[in-house]
């Protein structure tokens, strides 16, 4: 699978994707904020 995440539990896999999505959203917001402040 694409990013090397490995888990035997499907629910754990979904949780990992949710965390990844959350982090992407937070980091994306921070990046936009930094660009705005420049």
């Amino acid at each position: 699978h694409s990013d090397g995440i490995f888990t035997d539990s499907y629910s754990r896999y979904r949780k990992q994707m949710a965390v990844k999505k959350y982090l992407a959203a937070v980091l994306g917001k921070r990046y936009k904020q930094r660009v705005k402040n420049k």
């Epitope: 694409s2 990013d3 888990t7 499907y10």
Partner: antibody, heavy 117, light 112 residues
């Protein structure tokens, strides 16, 4: 209401590849877990793999590892399943299905792939 | 892989009578999140499968209440309390707890 519409039936030669599409409407495609399941004639169901379109993250059944590729095009809300090195045993109806609550809530109508020389 | 064993393979029941299908998994399907990802599907000839039951006992909306799911751990049951003509189909259990996701072999329900 989520709807999944799959591409039409295919007849393929042994050793070739097939690519089946599944177009989703009425839901958030990118944030869905899209699975592929197949059913050989008169047989049971077999899970092939999944894709999470936001990250294009895939997970494949061991049996199909190296032979199946699942992709997604977020711009058209379409998932694809490509199976290579086809053999007669791959003759089956191929379904896409979307997960909700850890279970397949929505299914495509199925695509019959016939492998014959 | 988790092996899902369904019994019986086929079942003939009189209209209005109870139909019981069993499903056994080779490993517990209780997940670390407290849920049991055991599902039941109904498939009629020439149609895609349809979700009936998920989380072992939660009925899909719109599914008649004559269908019920029960069980925990490794042993599960689908019960049709009063068989109707439109219930003639193949029923599959499948587990969504562990990769690879796996299905039972199916139970064909017919009218006696």
């Amino acid at each position: 209401e989520v709807q999944l519409v799959q591409s039409g039936a295919e007849v393929k030669k042994p050793g070739s590849s097939v690519k089946v599409s599944c177009k989703a409407s009425g839901g958030t495609f990118s944030d869905s877990y899209m699975h592929w399941v197949r059913q050989a004639p008169g047989q049971g169901l077999e899970w092939m793999g999944l894709i999470y379109p936001i990250f294009a993250d895939t997970r494949y059944a061991q049996k199909f590892q190296g032979r199946v590729t699942i992709t997604a095009d977020e711009s058209t809300s379409t998932a694809y399943m490509e199976l290579s090195s086809l053999r007669s045993e791959d003759t089956a109806v191929y379904y896409c299905a979307i997960d909700q609550d850890g279970s397949f809530a929505y299914w495509g109508q199925g695509t019959l792939v016939t492998v014959s020389s | 892989d988790i092996v899902m064993t369904q019994s019986p393979d086929s079942l003939a029941v009189s209209l209005g009578e109870r139909a019981t299908i069993n499903c056994k998994s080779s490993q517990s399907l209780l997940d670390s999140d407290g849920k049991t990802y055991l599902n039941w599907l109904q498939q009629k000839p020439g149609q895609p499968p349809k979700r009936l039951i998920y989380w072992a006992s939660t009925r899909e909306s719109g599914v008649p209440d004559r269908f019920s799911g029960s069980g925990s751990g490794t042993d599960f049951t689908l019960t049709i309390s009063s068989l109707q003509a439109e219930d003639v189909a193949v029923y599959y259990c499948w587990q969504g707890t562990w990769f690879d996701l796996t299905f039972g072999g199916g139970t064909k329900v017919e009218i006696k």
